[in-house]
């Protein structure tokens, strides 16, 4: 058998069974379950004299371990005295010692009930900056109790002066409070309130519960952006897992392909959100040809707080294709904002919904952060539309008054792009249409000027500019005037903004 340290138990009589005139009394200490021999038992009798006798060790039949009892007989004023039995087992370790301090006899007592209560979450279901744990030690026969707080089994340095005791009838109750930071509480540690009373230990433990039902943990798998697919030619797909409760358990994301072929190396990012949840993203590079040929990619998500593995799959969208129509406008000057203008781009009637929108100035692509583009929305027909908005400065348009709105879409030909130029001052600079046939029903104009355009603030348009009614299915006021430039040679018309 391997080395085993002893368990030590005090042996006392019931106080009511000891005659009040007894001049001496015997108490004992049991050391059991140790191996090998020997144990050394010594007694601290305080100011009293006592005689000790240690019985020979006996072998426990089943385990082959040993047990021994040491007896102490004391005389004199033993009733108020505490005695300590000290058991050493050097085979376990040279300094292995267990002390048990107790009185001669045990009174009948009602043991305490130990219960930890936890402070509430805030109204939104989130943990406050600090969490209070309240240890209620209730319903015990009045007497000395000792409260200790443990964190993952280790004694904590806690100010216990706040503990308060009350007595109700013949029983007493005590409570002790522990304040923890949110960080400690969320770290998944176990907190224990340990109560020592009449030589016995009572305890209760608590920890932050795993959400029994995940708070709507969601996983999403994106398709590659048309820009990455057709322009950069380095498409990636991203598996996004949101609203995870932070915990020791890590999120496991596994990529696979329906064809069974190997996947590339993915990159992973974890972000703690303001609301305390965790967001995990994994980005996988995919082959352009593989994607275009219809390969299906799968992202499998497992986490201790998820009841079942989550699977997300993505593949090239099936169904009809339609190229986008691109229309770009400049808003008129607004009082008080002479040095800034907003450009708008409507891209519509495209299928499927995957589209990338870019703005260019001076043949340079502007950062995505410069413009704001809506998510694709369904038109009344079968296609989709988006709006994109770009704010430009006077310095930019004075440098070169031509801005290009470009849509990247798989159905656009010849190079998956359609773009439209727009000028802040259309009378001074005209854009040109590229890769865009004039859609049917765009304008009805007679080729003659139809009077002053409504939105131009009284300015007369460029002589080659003709105004006409907007499209019947335009998502805006039907009376909106638009401007067409009659260009020689190239495309017979172009949008140059609101008239």
């Amino acid at each position: 058998a391997s080395t085993q340290s002893p368990s030590v138990f005090p042996l006392t009589r019931c106080c009511k069974n000891i005659p009040s005139n007894a001049t001496s009394v015997t108490l004992g200490c049991l050391a059991t379950g140790y191996f090998p021999e020997p144990v050394m038992v010594t007694w601290d009798t305080g100011s009293l004299n006592g005689t000790t006798m240690t019985l020979p060790a006996t072998t426990l039949t089943l385990s082959g371990h040993y047990a021994t009892i040491s007896l102490l007989t004391v005389s004199g004023a033993w009733a108020k005295q505490m005695f300590t039995c000290r058991v050493a087992h050097t085979p376990s370790s040279t300094d292995w010692v267990d002390n048990k301090t107790f009185s001669v006899c045990s009174r009948d007592f009602t043991p305490p009930t130990v219960k930890i209560l936890q402070s509430s979450c805030d109204g939104g279901g989130h943990f406050p900056p600090t969490i209070q744990l309240l240890c209620l030690v209730s319903g015990y026969t009045p007497g000395t109790i000792n409260i200790t707080w443990l964190e993952d089994g280790q004694v904590m340095d806690v100010d216990l002066s706040t503990a308060s005791t009350t007595q109700e009838g013949e029983l007493a109750s005590t409570q002790s409070e522990l304040t923890l930071s949110q960080k400690h509480w969320l770290s998944d540690r176990t907190y224990t309130c340990q109560v020592t009373y009449q030589g016995h230990t009572f305890e209760d433990s608590t920890k932050k519960c795993a959400d029994s039902n995940p708070r709507g943990v969601s996983a999403y798998l994106s398709r590659p952006s048309p820009f990455d697919l057709f322009i950069r030619k380095s498409p990636t797909i991203t598996c996004l897992v949101v609203d995870l409760a932070p915990s020791k358990g890590t999120v496991n994301l596994t990529w696979s392909r329906a064809s069974g072929k190997p996947v590339n190396h993915s990159t992973r990012k974890e972000e703690k959100q303001r609301n305390g949840t965790l967001t995990v993203t994994s980005t996988l590079p995919v082959g352009t040809r593989d994607w275009i040929e219809g390969e299906t990619y799968q992202c499998r998500v497992t986490h201790p707080h998820l009841p079942r593995a989550l699977m997300r799959s993505t593949t090239k969208t099936s169904g009809p294709r339609a190229a986008p129509e691109v229309y770009a406008f400049a808003t008129p000057e607004w009082p008080g904002s002479r040095d800034k203008r907003t450009l708008a781009c409507l891209i519509q009637n495209f299928m499927p919904e995957d589209i990338s929108v870019q703005w260019l100035h001076n043949e340079v692509q502007l950062p995505d952060a410069r413009h704001s583009t809506t998510q694709p929305r369904k038109t009344k027909g079968s296609g989709f539309f988006v709006f994109s908005r770009l704010e430009v400065t006077r310095a930019e348009w004075e440098q070169k008054d031509e801005f290009i709105c470009r849509a990247v879409h798989e159905a656009a030909s010849p190079s998956q792009t359609v773009q439209r130029a727009v000028s802040v001052n259309p009378g001074l600079a005209g854009g040109s249409a590229q890769s865009q046939r004039a859609p049917d029903r765009v304008l009805c104009h007679s080729g003659q000027q139809q009077g002053l355009p409504r939105a131009a603030g009284g300015s007369v348009p460029h002589p080659r500019c003709h105004c006409g009614a907007g499209r019947a299915d335009w998502p805006g006021p039907p009376e909106l005037d638009v401007c067409v430039e009659e260009a020689e040679g190239e495309a017979p018309w172009t949008w140059t903004g609101l008239c």
Epitope: S218, Y220, A309, L310
Partner: antibody, heavy 119, light 110 residues
């Protein structure tokens, strides 16, 4: 091949307890989330509980408290403990394996074990 | 809690008929709707997973469609062995709901 064999059903009095076992073979149990589904005579399927590969468990609203799901991967067994049995717990209890890749449903079911609660 | 409402509860049809069973979720399901077939005295059998993917060994006359909250199982040409009860299941999570299964649709011989 994949096999799930339930046992532990039978006739039990109201208020009694039962422990259903599901012996799994033909696959690696630790790789799969496992579910118990029940079906009262002549009625539809009713989800009871699920235990994921990490050993964490969830229950249908009505099952919380009286039902306890557990797994012992070393014994290739999944358990369902039912306490304080009621007449309405009378049903065939199916042990079922969730698809490995997840969020796709149950690809293998046991034949079921009948639990009858009656005095 | 996502609730699954299946309709109709029963349908009478003849061999070679086209049969469609619908399942409505109380809120949008991103992924993971499954369909099962159950015959008397037998456990259910997985037919369709992830809305529309045919499970291994399932004949191609079975197809699944739908997105968001509306889903359908279609049997393009009913065969004698298809007379059974069909269940949809929201398989994305084990929500704390009363049930993640639809109430079932019994396909009977006309």
């Amino acid at each position: 091949q994949v096999q799930l064999v339930e046992s532990g059903g039978g006739l039990v009095q109201p208020g009694g307890s039962l422990r259903l076992s599901c012996a799994a073979s033909g696959f690696t149990l630790s790789n799969h989330d496992m579910t118990w589904v029940r079906q009262a005579p002549g009625k539809g399927l009713e989800y009871v509980s699920i235990i994921n590969t990490y050993g964490n468990h969830w229950y249908a609203n009505w099952a919380s408290g009286r039902f306890t799901i557990s797994r012992d991967n070393s014994k290739n067994t999944v358990y369902l403990q039912i306490d304080s049995l009621r007449a309405e717990d009378t049903a065939t209890y199916y042990c079922a394996r969730e698809t490995h890749h997840g969020s796709s449903g149950i690809d293998h079911w046991g034949q079921g074990t009948l639990v009858t609660v009656s005095s | 809690d996502i609730q699954m409402t299946q309709s109709p509860s029963s349908v009478s049809a003849s061999v070679k008929d086209r049969v469609t069973i619908t399942c409505q979720a109380s809120e949008s399901i991103y992924s993971g709707l499954a369909w099962y077939q159950q015959k008397p005295g037998q456990p259910p059998k997985l037919l369709i997973y992830d809305h529309s993917t045919l499970a291994s060994g399932v004949p191609s006359r079975f197809s699944g469609s739908g997105s968001g909250t509306e889903y359908a199982l279609t049997i393009s040409s009913l065969q004698p062995e298809d007379f059974a009860t069909y269940y949809c299941q929201h398989a994305d999570y084990a929500h704390h709901s009363d049930n993640v299964f639809g109430g079932g649709t019994k396909v009977e011989i006309k």
